[in-house]
Interface confidence: medium
Amino acid sequence: GQNITARIGEPLVLSCKGAPKKPPQQLEWKLNTGRTEAWKVLSPQGGPWDSVARILPNGSLLLPATGIVDEGTFRCRATNRRGKEVKSNYRVRVYQIPGKPEIVDPASELTASVPNKVGTCVSEGSYPAGTLSWHLDGKLLIPDGKETLVKEETRRHPETGLFTLRSELTVIPTQGGTHPTFSCSFSLGLPRRRPLNTAPIQLRVREPGPPEGIQLLVEPEGGIVAPGGTVTLTCAISAQPPPQVHWIKDGAPLPLAPSPVLLLPEVGHEDEGTYSCVATHPSHGPQESPPVSIRVTETGDEGPAEGSVGESGLGTLA
């Protein structure tokens, strides 16, 4: 299969290998994503799923605006002009490049032989979370837990699903009189994507004077949705390998296949309740998220704040 990375909010076209470019075509697209119940076969004629994905006249598949819940597997099976079956298999991951990282609350100077907070590096609006790294005089700084300490925090925006990363660097300089330069970089970990770097900060080291938490995200935000709307619950865990995620509603396990995303389309009052996710990691055992409450209520014309990332309507298609 082929790994595809698509930028959130932008259209994605997947080609169906072997498919004749014009009808008549013998082809079948199916997808298994955060939006579907297991595998979903798409009709070439279009249909109820067209706001999610639709087959173009040339046999390609169009996702009008990719979102986090569109991550998954897409498969096409086509019969070419010579009658041979050709299969295409895509693993789609989505990404969002954050703004340039910044070092906030930088130290004005450092003191030798004692722990000093250098500053906090902040990156906002990434997907997936990505990583922050610190550099000292242009070289990667590897935390050793003694002279170099890094405290990291990852938060996910409840509405957009995008990540904010914070990394606080604490160092114990060995001697005074030096002027080290610190910088921080953000990397999404995607091929051909350069890291984003902060502006460097140079600090003076002086000699010492006298001693002197797993997250459950809900979309729409607040968990309030109109009847017939869609709720997306995402269990955000930064663990490798990714743990198995099960879902609990009102204290009882839901009989669903493990998945970090729980999609509830067409909601009604039956779907109301308190939801949590349980992540089971081989080495750590189960870990339950804080609960979120889902309430179904008509929101009127102020707007339902419902839907997921990338669920806008399609552009005009011939």
Epitope: G47, P48, S312
Partner: antibody, heavy 119, light 107 residues
């Protein structure tokens, strides 16, 4: 409270045209698929046309394709069905229905408007 | 096109009876089936959505279940106001397809 009110029904001769309207209120209109469903006297329900949230994509069964056109005006919270080349078999109560935000489904229905095609 | 074969087309039952109506889809439609109730001269009313979920304001005596491509609407204890016609609908593919309807009459 969700409300859908159809209008525009009436008696029309075979080959004639009619335009049905559906006024929507109580929900954010442009977030939902909208659908027309009809019911011939004493018969079951039949899907007639659907339109997605944006209005860019429309869908019809073969029985009305090329004769009926569904459209929406999101600014006016209104749904329309333009019916041309009407036949006796198009005689029915026509219902306007609200679908879902991602999927075309049927949630809330109007009370319907009667269309009679007869000479 | 998907066919939704609904059975029985009519049934006679008494108040308090358990009533079961079935729709069989001609191909896999996932969980994307709704059930509706319609009384004479009235618009249909949604009872069950996504195969098994009770719609707002619907009494708990109504329930829906799914086994593969078979979908069942059950009324656990029939009440006088339940005498009506019931329809299933698949909304996984266009054309959206209704079952032929089941008329529930008083015995």
């Amino acid at each position: 409270e969700v409300q859908l009110v159809e209008s525009g029904g009436g008696l029309v001769q075979p080959g004639g045209s009619l335009r049905l309207s559906c006024a929507a209120s109580g929900f954010t209109f442009n977030n939902y698929w909208m659908t027309w469903v009809r019911q011939a006297p004493g018969k079951g329900l039949e899907w007639v046309a659907s339109i997605d949230n944006s209005g860019d994509n429309t869908y019809y069964p073969d029985s009305v394709k090329d004769r009926f056109t569904i459209s929406r005006d999101n600014a006016k919270n209104s749904l329309y069905l333009q019916m041309n080349s009407l036949r006796a078999e198009d005689t029915a109560v026509y219902y306007c229905a609200r679908g879902g935000d991602i999927l075309d489904s049927l949630h809330f229905w109007g009370q319907g408007t009667l269309v009679t095609v007869s000479s | 096109d998907i066919q939704m074969t609904q059975s029985p087309s009519s049934l006679s039952a008494s108040v308090g009876d358990r009533v079961t109506i079935t729709c069989r889809a001609s191909q896999d439609v996932g969980i994307y089936v709704n059930w509706f109730q319609q009384k004479p001269g009235k618009a249909p009313r949604r009872l069950i959505y996504r195969a098994t979920n009770l719609a707002d304001g619907v009494p708990s005596r109504f329930s829906g279940s799914r086994s593969g491509t078979d979908f069942t609407l059950t009324i656990s204890s029939l009440q006088p106001e339940d005498f009506a016609t019931y329809y299933c609908l698949e909304f996984d593919e266009h054309p959206l397809t209704f079952g032929g309807g089941t008329k529930v009459e008083i015995k």
